[in-house]
Interface confidence: medium
């Protein structure tokens, strides 16, 4: 119960998370700029990765997207790439981590299958979480370091236009939404580590092997199983024969030490 | 680069009409907001209206809404501004600008042309 509830719980977490990361990569709040402001009139301009935008006091807004790669900065490429492989890898991740919830019933997937698969997600969780804290942390340092560029600077493929004023930009919402973000993705897929362990069954030395005997003075083990062994090689611990039909419900797996909580 | 030149000042009386033209040259006209910016004898430079690089969108000051038009014809690489109910107070030089966005704020605008003067008077 706990590992299904921990599985759940990693899965709406990164889900959230990676929905913020999505979010914060098509917003234009990563650097805010007060280009002037006076009384009368106040001039915002903020950018994203993909376009820049200028708000009055007035009501006028107006969004221009990078039309250049060239002219952009390295860092502003770098980031570009890391949210989306962030992106890519929490999409993947949550594809995944719905087939390896323990809650949903895919053909006959044993426990083992779903514990890979829930390791796979939640490593793909924490790396995307990691991309997308990189990501934003490497804009904000461009924005501490005053290396992000001013606006017209930026668009020397329109032209070569120069900007009269530099100005500083200061931190957007973008960047605090991709922290939040990120960081539920690094815990979602921490949670979804975590779970597997507890979905994987116990290892042990010794590999049992369960039969029924054919006589009428057998003893019967609680769950419905007869009788077992400690010998021979039956790896996946199947019932060598089975004398009658018995439902699934009749049949109970192994314990783990997981499942006592 | 992008060069502007405006054209259409003179003299006209108070509630009369004039249309200041803006010719750019150059292939990239059509990249930049434009803008018109006034600067009357002793005064600052003052917003008066500006227009998208599509031509989608306008900005105009309070002090000219209703009066004034702007328009731009990228295939002929001109800006407009069409000007009515002209007052004493529009009395200025008015000069052409360009820049990446439509806005009020004269730090936008990179390219600026010569000016040219519109004096109201009786």
């Known amino acids: 119960m706990a590992v299904t509830a921990c599985q759940g719980l990693g899965f709406v977490v990164s889900l959230i998370g990676i929905a913020g990361i999505i979010a914060a990569t098509c917003m234009d709040q990563w650097s805010t700029q007060d280009l002037y402001n006076n009384p009368v009139t106040a001039v915002f301009n903020y950018q994203g990765l993909w376009r820049s935008c200028v708000r009055e006091s007035s009501g006028f807004t107006e969004c221009r997207g990078y039309f250049t790669l060239l002219g952009l900065p390295a860092m502003l490429q770098a980031v570009r790439a890391l949210m989306i492989v962030g992106i890519v890898l929490g999409a993947i991740g949550l594809l995944v981590s719905i087939f390896a919830l323990k809650c949903i019933r895919i053909g006959s997937m044993e426990d083992s299958a779903k514990a890979n698969m829930t390791l796979t997600s939640g490593i793909m969780f924490i790396v995307s979480g990691l991309c997308a804290i990189a990501g934003v942390s490497v804009f904000a340092n461009m924005l501490v370091t005053n290396f992000w560029m001013s606006t017209a600077n930026m668009y020397t493929g329109m032209g070569g236009m120069v900007q009269t004023v530099q100005t500083r930009y200061t931190f957007g919402a973008a960047l605090f939404v991709g922290w939040v973000a990120g960081g539920l993705t690094l815990i979602g897929g921490v949670m979804m580590c975590i779970a597997c362990r507890g979905l994987a069954p116990e290892e042990t030395n010794y590999k049992a092997v369960s039969y029924h005997a054919s006589g009428h003075s057998v003893a019967y083990k609680p769950g419905g199983f007869k009788a077992s062994t400690g010998f021979g090689s039956n790896t996946k611990n199947k019932k060598i024969y089975d004398g009658g039909a018995r439902t699934e419900d009749e049949v109970q797996s192994y314990p783990s030490k997981h499942d006592y909580v | 680069e992008v060069q502007l030149v405006e054209s259409g000042g003179g003299l006209v009386q108070p509630g009369g009409s004039l249309r200041l033209s803006c010719a750019a040259s150059?292939?990239?006209?059509?990249?930049?907001?434009v803008g018109w910016f006034r600067q009357a004898p002793g005064k600052g430079l003052e917003f008066v209206a500006a227009?998208?690089?599509?031509?989608?969108?306008?900005n105009y000051a309070d002090s000219v809404k209703g009066r004034f038009t702007i328009s731009r014809d990228n295939a002929k690489n001109t800006l407009y501004l069409q000007m009515n109910s002209l007052r004493a107070e529009d009395t200025a030089v008015y000069y052409c600008?360009?820049?990446?966005?439509?806005?009020?704020?004269?730090?936008?605008?990179?390219?600026w042309g010569q000016g040219t003067l519109v004096t109201v008077s009786s």
């Open positions: 227009i998208t690089w599509s031509g989608g969108s306008t």
């Open positions: 150059g292939r990239t006209f059509s990249n930049y907001a």
């Open positions: 600008a360009g820049g990446f966005f439509a806005t009020s704020y004269s730090g936008n605008y990179g390219y």
